[in-house]
Amino acid sequence: SQPQAVPPYASENQTCRDQEKEYYEPQHRICCSRCPPGTYVSAKCSRIRDTVCATCAENSYNEHWNYLTICQLCRPCDPVMGLEEIAPCTSKRKTQCRCQPGMFCAAWALECTHCELLSDCPPGTEAELKDEVGKGNNHCVPCKAGHFQNTSSPSARCQPHTRCENQGLVEAAPGTAQSDTTCKNPLEPLPPEMSGTMLM
C-alpha cells in the first residue's frame, strides 16, 4: 500500500535504486533509507514507515550515509602520540588530526595513529619537500650548487651563498655546501696565510 516514489519499497532482487542512500532490509524484503551524515537510526524502517533518523548528540558523529543505531564518539588528537588538532569534530566529521611540527607519521591505520620525531639532516643537506607535511620521515638531499646548510636539523633549509659584491665586499673564502661565503672589505689586508700568494 506504499507508493513507489519514496522508501520503503519492495525489492525482490535485494538491490535498491540508490545504493549510497538506501539499504536492503531482509526481514521485510524492502529497501529503506539510510540516515544522512550527522544522524543515526532512531527507529528501523517497517513495511509502512521509512527509517527514522535523529541528529547525533554533541561530541559524536557519523560521517557517511548509514543505518547505524549509534553515533561514533569524537576522539581528541592524542598529544602523547605526537598528534595535534587541525579541525574540531562535528556531527558529520571526526576530529581532524596531524603530526605536530617536527614529527612524521610512523603508524597509519586508515589515519595516523602515532607520530615520531623527524630525523635530522646533517650539514650540507636539507629535507626533501613532501606533498603532505608529516606523511613520512625526512629524506635528506644535498644542497644544490650555490647553497649551504650548516646545522644538524630536521627542518633547516639550504640557503643561497652570500654574494659579497652585493654588499660592496669581496670574497675572502668561497662557500661550500656546509658553509657560507666569507666576505671582506676590499681594503682589508689579506689574512696572513694568504699574504705570500699576494706577493707572488
Partner: antibody, heavy 126, light 107 residues
Framework: QITLKESGPTLVKPTQTLTLTCTFT??????????VGWIRQPPGKALEWLAL???????LYSPSLKNRLTITKDTSKNQVVLTMTNMDPVDTATYYC??????????????????WGQGTTVTVSP | EIVLTQSPVTLSLSPGERATLSCRAS???????LVWYQQKPGQAPRLLIY???SRPTGIPDRFSGSGSGTDFTLTISRLEPEDFAVYYC????????FGGGTKVEIK
C-alpha cells in the same frame, strides 16, 4: 506542545467531495519520523483509520477506501489536507487528525498516534 | 490486510477489579507495532500503550500491555472510576487498522 485542529464543512451532500484540513503546531512535517493521520468514527461505532502522510512524502491509505481518498501536506503552512470523493450518508462521522510518531524519554521513536485533534463532525445528507 | 479482533466486546466490572482485554491479529505482527488507546465518551482517543508494552509519560502504572505474534493483552490491575471507557488496539505492521474496541463498563 503538539496541538492539532480539524476544519472543514459540517454538512455535505451525497456524491460531493469532502475536503478536511488539519492545522497543527508544535512539530514540523519535515522532521524525520513525523506523520499526520486521519481517523473517523461513525456515531456509536469503532474508530476507522483512513490515511496517513509521513515526513518524507510517503502516503498510506485504508485499502477499503483507497480509491476515494487523497492526502497531501503543506509543510510551510503546517497543514495536512484529506479529500474524500463521492460522499455517502454512511460516511457521516467525527473525523479526527492525529500526530503519528512518539518519542519516549530515552529519545527512542515508536509508532503510535500520541496527540489527537478534538475532531470535527461531518454529516452527509441530501 | 491484517484484521484485529478485540474481545470481549463488553467487559462489566466493578472498581478495584482487574480487567484483561484481548487483541488478536489475523496474522503475526512485529510486537513493536501494536498500540492501545483509551476513549471516553465525547473525547478523542488517548495513547495508552506503545510498542505493545510501553507506557507514555503520564499513563498510570496500573495499565500494562503484553503479548507478541498474534495475541496481545491490555491489563488494568485495579480499575479506577475514570478507567471505564472504550479501549482500542491498532497495528502499525501493515496498514494501520484498529480493532473493534472493548467497552469496559461499571457492573
Amino acid at each position: 506542545q503538539i496541538t492539532l485542529k480539524e476544519s472543514g464543512p459540517t454538512l455535505v451532500k451525497p456524491t460531493q467531495t469532502l475536503t478536511l484540513t488539519c492545522t497543527f503546531t508544535g512539530f514540523s512535517l519535515s522532521t524525520s519520523g513525523m506523520g499526520v493521520g486521519w481517523i473517523r468514527q461513525p456515531p456509536g461505532k469503532a474508530l476507522e483509520w483512513l490515511a496517513l502522510i509521513y515526513w518524507n512524502g510517503g502516503k498510506l491509505y485504508s485499502p477499503s477506501l483507497k480509491n476515494r481518498l487523497t492526502i497531501t501536506k503543506d509543510t510551510s503552512k503546517n497543514q495536512v489536507v484529506l479529500t474524500m470523493t463521492n460522499m455517502d450518508p454512511v460516511d457521516t462521522a467525527t473525523y479526527y487528525c492525529a500526530h503519528s510518531g512518539y518519542y519516549d524519554n530515552s529519545g527512542y521513536y515508536w509508532d503510535g498516534m500520541d496527540v489527537w485533534g478534538q475532531g470535527t463532525t461531518v454529516t452527509v445528507s441530501p | 490486510e491484517i484484521v484485529l479482533t478485540q474481545s470481549p466486546v463488553t467487559l462489566s466490572l466493578s472498581p478495584g477489579e482487574r480487567a484483561t482485554l484481548s487483541c488478536r491479529a489475523s496474522q503475526s505482527l512485529i510486537s513493536d507495532y501494536l498500540v492501545w488507546y483509551q476513549q471516553k465518551p465525547g473525547q478523542a482517543p488517548r495513547l495508552l500503550i506503545y510498542g505493545a508494552s510501553s507506557r507514555p509519560t503520564g499513563i498510570p502504572d496500573r495499565f500494562s500491555g503484553s503479548g507478541s505474534g498474534t495475541d496481545f493483552t491490555l491489563t488494568i490491575s485495579r480499575l479506577e472510576p475514570e478507567d471505564f471507557a472504550v479501549y482500542y488496539c491498532q497495528q502499525y505492521d501493515t496498514s494501520l487498522n484498529f480493532g473493534g474496541g472493548t467497552k469496559v463498563e461499571i457492573k
